[in-house]
């Protein structure tokens, strides 16, 4: 514990001189800034060296005294300039100054590399007052030094807005080499040269580097840090590390794996996410990339029908997001689908093939050759057509939808008829005489209603007209036919 001396007693030795080594044991300081821990540092450096007082940073404070009294110059005593110690050791160093008591207002602080050390935990300031002079020792201790404690430490005393600065004390923390750059894992092309870099620092310097490949040293002679290892090429995976040596010992870097790029493994788990009449959405899990990023993927689609010609459709897509919608497929058809992906080395094998089916769709074309004629005796309109080609039915026909629109003197009326799938004719009752009837027909499957045929018009005369003739779907490009009877 720090005890206080008798405040008016004056037994304390003054600077300059072998201070504080010559202090008698009962000469305890008047004041102190306590150390946070009671740790006794492993190294203690005396604040002074015998000989001349330090004159490098002498300050004669510019104070205009009421009675113009001159103030003597002040300077910190010389102290040890350079402290070298091992990591995790303790250190204590100090600066000292004798301040005449007429300097009634001073502050003392520690700075490291130009920044004030604000924490009080390391600092202890002791005062040894005498009648005319107060000796001040400002000590700084570090219990377990780290590399970050390296630097230049100074004391600053501020008096009347003037600063007195001590000589710097350089702290050099020595330890095992510390890596600033370690080799990085790489993926390389077979038999292609590549470089690895290793850099480590002390202190102490120099730091020498040995390279290790698969537990065997590569270089017989060490290289000074930093070191670049050029590997002419590999045919198989290898693990590299570097050893950094200095006078304190050896540090080994992390081991890094150098992989040889290869073609990817085939994708796995190709699955159907959604099917429509003409498209299938698939997803897949990419296989191992062969240590080289995927560039793109290829979706191969072939008809599963044994009677098909076996041709394969190929769709190319980006490697991400492992999802693709295959379009332009036939409705109600079976397909085999496989996926292959590539990296810079080449294409993977194709994934296991999966079977997928499109659903039933609405027909893609209208019924053909629609003809309409008036059966005046029964007051009906007869309609005939041909079913769409099987391939374009996109499903199993369940019937037809007939739209007939009756127009007369500004009045228009549309009616819809549903007809079963058998046959290709229908009869509808005349709704209005002296009117135009416009007929359109669409094929229907369970997948929906297909497009309507082009309109066919027929004029229904007033009762008593004799002549009539059929009206039919026009040839492409012709105007809508109108038959007047």
């Amino acid at each position: 514990a720090i005890t206080e001396a008798r405040e008016e007693a004056k037994p304390y030795p003054l600077f300059p001189g072998p201070f504080p080594g010559s202090l008698q044991t009962d000469h305890t300081p008047l004041l102190s800034l306590p150390h946070a821990s009671g740790y006794q540092p492993a190294l203690m450096f005396s604040p002074t060296q015998p000989g001349r007082p330090h004159t490098g940073n002498v300050a004669i404070p510019q104070v205009t005294s009421v009675e113009s009294k001159p103030l003597p110059p002040l300077a910190f005593k010389h102290t040890v300039g350079h402290i070298i110690l091992s990591e995790h050791k303790g250190v204590k160093f100090n600066c000292s100054i004798s301040v005449p008591n007429i300097y009634q207002d001073t502050t003392i602080s520690w700075w490291k590399d130009g920044k004030e050390l604000l924490g009080a935990h390391h600092a202890i300031t002791q005062f040894y007052p005498d009648d005319e002079v107060t000796a001040i020792i400002a000590s700084f201790s570090i219990t377990s030094v780290q590399r970050s404690d390296n630097g230049s430490y100074i004391c600053k005393m501020k008096i009347n807005n003037e600063e007195i600065v001590s000589d710097p004390i350089y702290i050099e923390v020595q330890g095992l080499p510390h890596f600033t750059k370690q080799p990085e894992s790489m993926n390389v092309t077979r038999n292609t040269a590549f470089n690895l870099t290793c850099q480590a620092v002390g202190p102490p310097e120099p730091v020498n580097i040995f390279w290790v490949q698969n537990s065997s040293r590569v270089n017989e002679q060490p290289e000074k840090s930093p070191s670049v290892l050029t590997v002419p090429g590999l045919t198989e995976m290898a693990v590299f590390s570097c050893e950094a040596h200095n006078d304190k010992g050896l540090t080994v870097s992390k081991g890094v794996q150098i992989n040889i790029k290869a073609i990817p493994s085939p994708p796995t788990e190709v699955s159907i996410r959604n099917s429509t009449a003409h498209s299938i959405l698939i997803s897949w899990v990419p296989g191992f990339d062969g240590y080289s990023p995927f560039r793109n993927c290829s979706i191969q689609v072939k008809e599963a029908d044994p009677l098909s010609n076996g041709s394969v459709m190929i769709f190319n897509t980006s490697a991400l997001p492992h999802l693709y919608q295959i379009k332009q497929l036939q409705a109600l058809a079976n397909y085999s689908i496989g996926v292959s992906c590539m990296n810079e080395i080449g294409w993977s094998a194709v994934s296991p093939w999966i079977l997928a089916s499109t659903t039933e769709g609405a027909p893609s074309v209208a019924p053909l050759n629609v003809t309409v004629f008036l059966n005046e005796s029964s007051d009906n309109v007869d309609i005939r057509w041909m079913k769409p080609p099987t391939k374009q039915q996109d499903g199993e026909l369940v019937g037809y939808r007939i739209s007939h629109v009756w127009q007369s003197a500004g009045i228009s009326k549309e009616l819809l008829e549903e007809v079963g799938q058998n046959g290709s004719r229908a009869r509808i009752s005349v709704q209005v005489h002296n009117a135009t009837c416009t007929v359109r027909i669409a094929a229907v499957t369970r997948g929906g209603v297909g497009p309507f045929s082009d309109p066919v018009k027929i004029f229904i005369p007033a009762h008593g007209w004799v002549d009539y003739a059929p009206s039919s779907t026009p040839a492409p490009g012709n105007a809508d036919p109108v038959l007047i009877i």
Partner: antibody, heavy 120, light 107 residues
Framework: QVQLVQSGSELKKPGASVKVSCKAS????????MNWVRQAPGQGLEWMGW????????TYADDFKGRFVFSLDTSVSTAYLQISSLKAEDTAVYYC?????????????WGQGTLVTVSS | DIQMTQSPSSLSASVGDRVTITCRAS??????VAWYQQKPGKAPKRLIY???NRHTGVPSRFSGSGSGTEFTLTISNLQPEDFATYYC?????????FGGGTKLEIK
């Protein structure tokens, strides 16, 4: 031994002036600065400022700039506090307090205090 | 200016008790804190300087601790003569500033 002896109580009218003295003994007067501290009735301590007893240079806290003057007579080891244009709110006990060693600004010895009462 | 916030403002305790008074600085004042005891009608009396050092003649039951912004004065085994008002003072930066005081009363 160190002693700081202050002048006796004062009763003043508003607008008047008062000068409080603080006589030091038992140490070298010019080696320690002198602080002045005010304590209004029932209130806490308030640092007014200090005077460098070697150079005679005063330093005032912001609230005590203007009507308050610190001065010295080193021949008789005495510090003075003068307050002019007294106001009722200047009623307080005024203490002188010796500054501790250089590089530590706390007070190690105090005067017994002087009660200044301002009343019409 | 550096504010010194002292707590509690008053405290009741019995002889033999242990009490702690706290001062919080509004910025880092290192260990530049002193503690004073004042009895009614008397000048303050010095107790602790530089946060943790007892002045000559101050009983060992008074102890101070802290650095930076948090400081405490502890009185163990309270004696009848310890009932008084206690003040902290930061003397790191001008203007010097006191805490508001803690009045220690007999329970």
């Amino acid at each position: 031994q160190v002693q700081l002896v202050q002048s006796g109580s004062e009763l003043k009218k508003p607008g008047a002036s008062v000068k409080v003295s603080c006589k030091a003994s038992g140490y070298t007067f010019t080696n320690h600065g002198m602080n002045w501290v005010r304590q209004a009735p029932g209130q806490g301590l308030e640092w007014m400022g200090w005077i460098n007893t070697y150079t005679g240079e005063p330093t005032y806290a912001d609230d005590f700039k203007g009507r308050f003057v610190f001065s010295l007579d080193t021949s008789v080891s005495t510090a003075y506090l003068q307050i002019s244009s007294l106001k009722a709110e200047d009623t307080a006990v005024y203490y002188c307090a010796r500054k501790g060693v250089t590089a530590a600004r706390y007070f190690d010895y105090w005067g017994q205090g002087t009660l200044v009462t301002v009343s019409s | 200016d550096i504010q010194m916030t002292q707590s509690p403002s008053s405290l009741s305790a019995s002889v033999g008790d242990r009490v702690t008074i706290t001062c919080r600085a509004s910025q880092n004042v290192r260990t530049a804190v002193a503690w004073y005891q004042q009895k009614p009608g008397k000048a303050p009396k010095r107790l602790i300087y530089l946060a943790s050092n007892r002045h000559t003649g101050v009983p060992s039951r008074f102890s101070g601790s802290g650095s930076g912004t948090e400081f405490t004065l502890t009185i163990s085994n309270l004696q009848p003569e310890d009932f008084a008002t206690y003040y902290c003072l930061q003397h790191w930066n001008y203007p010097l500033t006191f805490g508001g005081g803690t009045k220690l009363e007999i329970k």
